[in-house]
Interface confidence: medium
């Protein structure tokens, strides 16, 4: 049967919900899937169920709620129906489903090289997603940076931070690294998608040599 797969708000001002629409062998024809929603009214859910305002904008098998339909102060209930019957139901508040867009504009700068010339430290910087209104305090994002050598499969994770830059220590010179960052709303459990990968190439020791050494 169809099931909700995810509801997500990228910026606390809109949200969308997605569902599966798999037809399994031996199941009866379910007919068209519709999404209905209602809002919490004290201990009881109001019986005023309304149909999805926009089945198109968030893609196939989805419902998009623009800012006119979204409020942070009100809990929502949504249900999927087919042939008049409910096939899945879920309830949430907008703040529980915040999953920010990926951080953007990743870049790095060299901090220093070890005396042995084997390791180097870099500073990685990025920007918050454009639609996250950080200045107003509308969103408070926590970032997680991951990095690995290009030929490795396992990512190393750094502790979550609230700033948009972080030093990465003891990278091996002569190796190429991949770095990626993702964010989540502080105190909520949903990380957003990762940023595009930033490639960090640390050149040979000789290229870091100070000019004075040649004289």
């Amino acid at each position: 049967e169809p099931k909700f797969t995810k509801c997500r708000s990228p910026e606390r001002e809109t949200f969308s919900c997605h569902w599966t629409d798999e037809v399994h062998h031996g199941t009866k024809n379910l007919g068209p899937i519709q999404l209905f929603y209602t809002r919490r009214n004290t201990q009881e859910w109001t019986q005023e169920w309304k149909e999805c305002p926009d089945y198109v904008s968030a893609g196939e098998n989805s419902c998009y709620f623009n800012s006119s339909f979204t409020s942070i102060w009100i809990p929502y209930c949504i249900k999927l129906t087919s042939n008049g019957g409910t096939v899945d139901e879920k309830c949430f508040s907008v703040d529980e489903i915040v999953q920010p867009d990926p951080p953007i504009a990743l870049n790095w700068t060299l901090l220093n090289v070890s005396l042995t010339g084997i390791h180097a430290d870099i500073q990685v910087r990025w920007e918050a997603p454009r639609n996250a209104d950080i200045q107003k305090g509308w969103m408070v994002l926590e970032y997680e940076l991951q990095y690995k050598e290009v030929n490795e499969t396992k990512w190393k994770m750094m502790d979550p931070i609230l700033t948009t830059s972080v030093p990465v220590y003891s990278l091996k010179v002569d190796k190429e690294y991949e770095v990626r960052v993702r964010s989540k709303q502080r105190n909520s459990g949903n990380y957003g998608e990762f940023s595009e990968v930033l490639y960090v190439t640390l050149p040979q020791m000789s290229q870091f040599t100070c000019e004075e050494d040649f004289y």
């Epitope: 606390r12 919490r40 102060w73 009100i74 508040s93 703040d95 305090g137 408070v140």
Partner: antibody, heavy 125, light 107 residues
Framework: EVQLVESGGGLVQPGGSLRLSCAAS????????IHWVRQAPGKGLEWVAY????????SYADSVKGRFTISADTSKNTAYLQMNSLRAEDTAVYYC????????????????????WGQGTLVTV | DIQMTQSPSSLSASVGDRVTITCRAS??????VAWYQQKPGKAPKLLIY???SLYSGVPSRFSGSRSGTDFTLTISSLQPEDFATYYC?????????FGQGTKVEIK
């Protein structure tokens, strides 16, 4: 018993600063948002700012944006309103009020609306 | 910001009268409207939330209703303790706004 108690009001010169406190008791502070609402003498109610201490969210009315800062200390169950660059038009009684955060409707009977208010503290600029 | 236009700004009524106060939102706010009562020198008190839900402990003579972006507070039979100022409030938007208030006075 749910209680909100404001303090920190007083007389201040234009351009000066003041910090208001709102001490909460009798409910789980993290499960609510705390709002500051003011009322100028003989006038109506004006919403000023709010903070959701669990998520760290804040928001401000345009009239105070950039001058006022709302914060909270969950260990003390207290919300604060730091008011800088005060103007004559900021003269008002300042109330703090609770609005349950909708994330918590699973755990308690959720209702919207500012259900508990402090007694108010007067700020004169 | 969403404007809440409240009317009338004041009214005179007698004990036992039916009193109606209206509020119009400048855009859709769903049912995210509350009504408050305030007496001089006191903090406001919540009467109605979600446009029509009666807050616990509030007498049943108070009721709220919604028609689109129009919201109504009705006091079915005015009592002496009901003479006060009443405010509507929308909490649909993250920037919460109040109506200008309606003062209910003794005729």
């Amino acid at each position: 018993e749910v209680q909100l108690v404001e303090s920190g009001g007083g007389l201040v010169q234009p351009g000066g600063s003041l910090r208001l406190s709102c001490a909460a008791s009798g409910f789980n502070f993290s499960y609510s948002s705390i709002h500051w609402v003011r009322q100028a003498p003989g006038k109506g109610l004006e919403w000023v700012a709010y903070i959701s201490s669990y998520y760290g969210y804040t928001s401000y009315a345009d009239s105070v944006k950039g001058r006022f800062t709302i914060s909270a200390d969950t260990s003390k169950n207290t919300a604060y309103l730091q008011m800088n660059s005060l103007r004559a038009e900021d003269t008002a009684v300042y109330y703090c009020a609770r609005l349950q955060h909708p994330s918590w409707y699973y755990y308690q009977g959720y209702h919207s609306g500012m259900d508990y208010w402090g007694q108010g503290t007067l700020v004169t600029v | 910001d969403i404007q809440m236009t409240q009317s009338p700004s004041s009214l005179s009524a007698s004990v036992g009268d039916r009193v109606t106060i209206t509020c119009r939102a400048s855009q859709s706010v769903s049912s995210a409207v509350a009504w408050y009562q305030q007496k001089p020198g006191k903090a406001p008190k919540l009467l109605i939330y979600s446009a029509s839900s009666l807050y616990s402990g509030v007498p049943s003579r108070f009721s709220g209703s919604r028609s689109g972006t129009d919201f109504t507070l009705t006091i079915s039979s005015l009592q002496p303790e009901d003479f006060a100022t009443y405010y509507c409030q929308q909490y649909w938007s993250s920037l919460i706004t109040f109506g200008q208030g309606t003062k209910v006075e003794i005729k």
